[in-house]
C-alpha cells in the first residue's frame, strides 16, 4: 500500500484534499466538507423513479481511478466527474446524464448504453 505523499507513488497527493459533500458525507466530514487522499467527485444518476439525483463527495485514492472512469452500468443512467486541482473543486463540476437512445427501449434485455466520458481536472 502506498504511503501518503511518498515520491514513489506518482498519483498520491502530498496533502489532504477537501471536497464538498452532498448525500454522500462520511462520518468524518464536517459542515458538508469531507477529506481525501484521492479525488473530489460530483455524480448524477437516476433514482428508481427516473428522477435525476446529484451527489458529491470524496473518493479515496485506492480504487478512485476506476470509479472516476465512469464505466457504464447496465440499466442505469449515470455520469460522474472527478477533480483534484483545488479544494472543493467539485462545486464546479456539472455532469449531465447520458442521453436516452431509442434502442434502450426496444432492444429487449440487451441495453446498449451511451458511454459518457468524464474529464479529469488536474
Amino acid at each position: 500500500k502506498k504511503e501518503d505523499g511518498e515520491s514513489t507513488a506518482p498519483t498520491a497527493r502530498p496533502k489532504v484534499l477537501r471536497c464538498k459533500c452532498h448525500h454522500h458525507c462520511p462520518e468524518d466530514s464536517v459542515n458538508n466538507i469531507c477529506s481525501t487522499d484521492g479525488y473530489c467527485f460530483t455524480m448524477i444518476e437516476e433514482d428508481d423513479s427516473g428522477t435525476p439525483v446529484v451527489t458529491s463527495g470524496c473518493l479515496g485514492l485506492e480504487g478512485s481511478d476506476f470509479q472516476c472512469r465512469d464505466t457504464p452500468i447496465p440499466h442505469q443512467r449515470r455520469s460522474i466527474e472527478c477533480c483534484t486541482e483545488r479544494n472543493e473543486c467539485n462545486k464546479d463540476l456539472h455532469p449531465t446524464l447520458p442521453p436516452l437512445k431509442d434502442r434502450d427501449f426496444v432492444d429487449g434485455p440487451i441495453h446498449h448504453k451511451h458511454h459518457h466520458h468524464h474529464h479529469h481536472h488536474h
Epitope: 501518503d4 502530498p14 496533502k15 477537501r18 468524518d28 481525501t36 470524496c58 485506492e62 479544494n87
Partner: antibody
Framework: QVQLQQPGAELVKPGASVKLSCKAS????????MQWVKQRPGQGLEWIGE????????LYNQKFKGKATLTVDTSSSTAYMQLSSLTSEDSAVYFC?????????WGQGTTLTVSS | DVVMTQTPLSLPVSLGDQASISCRSS???????????LHWYLQKPGQSPKLLIY???NRFSGVPDRFSGSGSGTDFTLKISRVEAEDLGVYFC?????????FGSGTKLEIK
C-alpha cells in the same frame, strides 16, 4: 531542509490585534497545508486552523473563529495568523506547522504576551 | 470534538528500561479513506514538538527503531524499547482524522 521561521516573541496590549508570521523554506510552499497550534503552559496543544497556500482555502477550529484569521503570501512563502481583540487568555506560544496528512515539521513558535 | 486521553500523565523510568504510553480517542480514528490518522510527537523543554510516529505505526525519517507505535480504532500505544537520556520530554498523541484536530494532554517521561 524544511524550515519554518517564526519571530521569538511579541508583546501586545489588551484589545489590540497582532499578525504573527511564519516563513517557510526548503520545500514547495504551495504543496502542503500550513497549520497553527496554540500552547499555553499546563493547557496542552490546541489546533487553531489551517490554510492551503495553493488556493488560500481555510478551515478553522470553531473555537477560534472570529479570533484568528489565516492568510498567506505565496511570493514570499510566508503564512500569517492575525489574532484580534486580544486578552490575557491569548497569551501563549503559537506554532506554525507544515501539514500533509499529519504535522511533519513545526516552527520554533512565537511567544505572545498580552499585557498592559 | 474528539477527546484524546493519554495515560500516564507522568512516567518515571530508568535509562535502558522499556516505556509504554497509552492514548485513547473518544471515537474511532479510522478515516473514510481507510487510513488511521493517529500520530505521536515528542516535545523537549523549550523546543517545538517533533514527529516520531505517523499513521499509528510508521516511524518518521531519522527516528530510531527503539520507537514503535501500535493500535487501532480508538486504542493506541507508543513503546520505547530502551529509554535513552535524549528521549526525555513530553510525548503527545494527535489525531488528524476529524476536524478539529486534537491532541492528548501529554505524558512526561522522566528519570526515576
Amino acid at each position: 531542509q524544511v524550515q519554518l521561521q517564526q519571530p521569538g516573541a511579541e508583546l501586545v496590549k489588551p484589545g489590540a490585534s497582532v499578525k504573527l508570521s511564519c516563513k517557510a523554506s526548503g520545500y514547495t510552499f504551495t504543496s502542503y497545508w500550513m497549520q497553527w497550534v496554540k500552547q499555553r503552559p499546563g493547557q496542552g496543544l490546541e489546533w487553531i486552523g489551517e490554510i492551503d497556500p495553493s488556493d488560500s482555502y481555510t478551515l478553522y477550529n470553531q473555537k477560534f473563529k472570529g479570533k484568528a484569521t489565516l492568510t498567506v503570501d505565496t511570493s514570499s512563502s510566508t503564512a500569517y495568523m492575525q489574532l484580534s481583540s486580544l486578552t490575557s487568555e491569548d497569551s501563549a506560544v503559537y506554532f506554525c506547522a507544515r501539514f500533509g496528512y499529519y504535522i511533519e515539521y513545526w516552527g520554533q513558535g512565537t511567544t505572545l504576551t498580552v499585557s498592559s | 470534538d474528539v477527546v484524546m486521553t493519554q495515560t500516564p500523565l507522568s512516567l518515571p523510568v530508568s535509562l535502558g528500561d522499556q516505556a509504554s504510553i497509552s492514548c485513547r480517542s473518544s471515537q474511532s480514528l479510522v478515516h473514510s479513506t481507510g487510513n488511521t490518522y493517529l500520530h505521536w510527537y515528542l516535545q523537549k523543554p523549550g523546543q517545538s514538538p517533533k514527529l516520531l510516529i505517523y499513521k499509528v505505526s510508521n516511524r518518521f525519517s531519522g527516528v530510531p527503531d527503539r520507537f514503535s507505535g501500535s493500535g487501532s480504532g480508538t486504542d493506541f500505544t507508543l513503546k520505547i524499547s530502551r529509554v535513552e537520556a535524549e528521549d526525555l520530554g513530553v510525548y503527545f498523541c494527535s489525531q488528524s482524522t476529524h476536524v478539529p484536530f486534537t491532541f492528548g494532554s501529554g505524558t512526561k517521561l522522566e528519570i526515576k
